[in-house]
Interface confidence: medium
């Protein structure tokens, strides 16, 4: 396989990673809120 450039720009990969992490965190927070709501309604 070809050698990659000595110094490579991975900035767009990192930006996508950051966005995916933010989305995952948002979903986790949403799920937590939903659980809390169900607990309140359940009571």
């Amino acid at each position: 396989s070809e050698e990659p450039p000595i110094s490579l720009d991975l900035t767009f990969h990192l930006l996508r990673e950051v966005l995916e992490m933010a989305r995952a965190e948002q979903l986790a927070q949403q799920a937590h809120s939903n659980r809390k709501l169900m607990e309140i309604i359940g009571k």
Epitope: P4, S7, L8, H13, L14, V18
Partner: antibody, heavy 115, light 112 residues
């Protein structure tokens, strides 16, 4: 909960080889870039290598190029670092980390290169 | 390679006081996307490092809001609104603009 557990460290003679492993759990391993970072005793952090989700791209610090190989097995949720032609200056704790931004770290495994 | 430089290398602080750590890069970390590719990590004594700040100013999940990251181009700062005893450790900046990613030599924060 994200967990990264390194293994495979130990004492090796100069010129010898070691293969480090990192077992990942608590996240979708195959969706993430993975990285190795090392820390020589009493020193700072040094980025060593990283590898793309599918293993198709990998990058190294100059000091390990041609000697170290980063690889992964997504079916086993595992990251590896094959280290050949080891030198005294490779002595360090080796950490595996999730992502390019190093979101989570393992506890590290100590590699000692000495005769 | 991009060289990262910390100042100070040692920072004695009194709990409750504000504090700041500087990091300078040998070339601009400001990308055309408008983001600065600079992360901050903390290594507490006897522990593995942990991500505090990514892309210059974004706090990682679970990081207290007493930490903040600022700066652009080549000059960056990690600020503590008030230092707590649990904040002791070595703080590292790292550039993620291009490989090889490089860390600064670290700033050791200690309690007076």
């Amino acid at each position: 909960e994200v967990q990264l557990v390194e293994s495979g460290g130990g004492l090796v003679q100069p010129g010898g080889s070691l293969r480090l492993s990192c077992a990942a759990s608590g996240f979708t391993f195959s969706d993430n870039w993975m990285s190795w970072v090392r820390q020589a005793p009493g020193k700072g952090l040094e980025w060593v290598a990283n590898i793309k989700q599918d293993g198709s791209e990998n990058y190294y610090v100059d000091s390990v190029k041609g000697r170290f190989t980063i690889s992964r097995d997504n079916a086993k949720n595992s990251l590896y670092l094959q280290m050949n032609s080891l030198r005294a200056e490779d002595t360090a704790v080796y950490y595996c980390s999730r992502g390019l931004a190093l979101w989570g770290w393992g506890q590290g495994t100590l590699v000692t290169v000495s005769s | 390679d991009i060289v990262m430089t910390h100042s100070p290398l040692s920072l004695p602080v009194t709990p409750g006081d504000p504090a700041s750590i500087s990091c300078r890069s040998s070339q601009s970390l400001l990308h055309s996307t408008g983001y600065n590719y600079l992360d901050w990590y903390l290594q507490k004594p006897g522990q593995s490092p942990q991500l505090l700040i990514y892309l210059g100013s974004n706090r990682a999940s679970g990081v207290p809001d007493r930490f903040s990251g600022s700066g652009s181009g080549t000059d960056f700062t990690l600020k503590f609104i008030r230092v707590e005893a649990e904040d002791v450790g070595v703080y590292y900046c790292m550039q993620a603009l291009q490989t090889p990613y490089t860390f600064g030599q670290g700033t050791k924060l200690e309690i007076k």
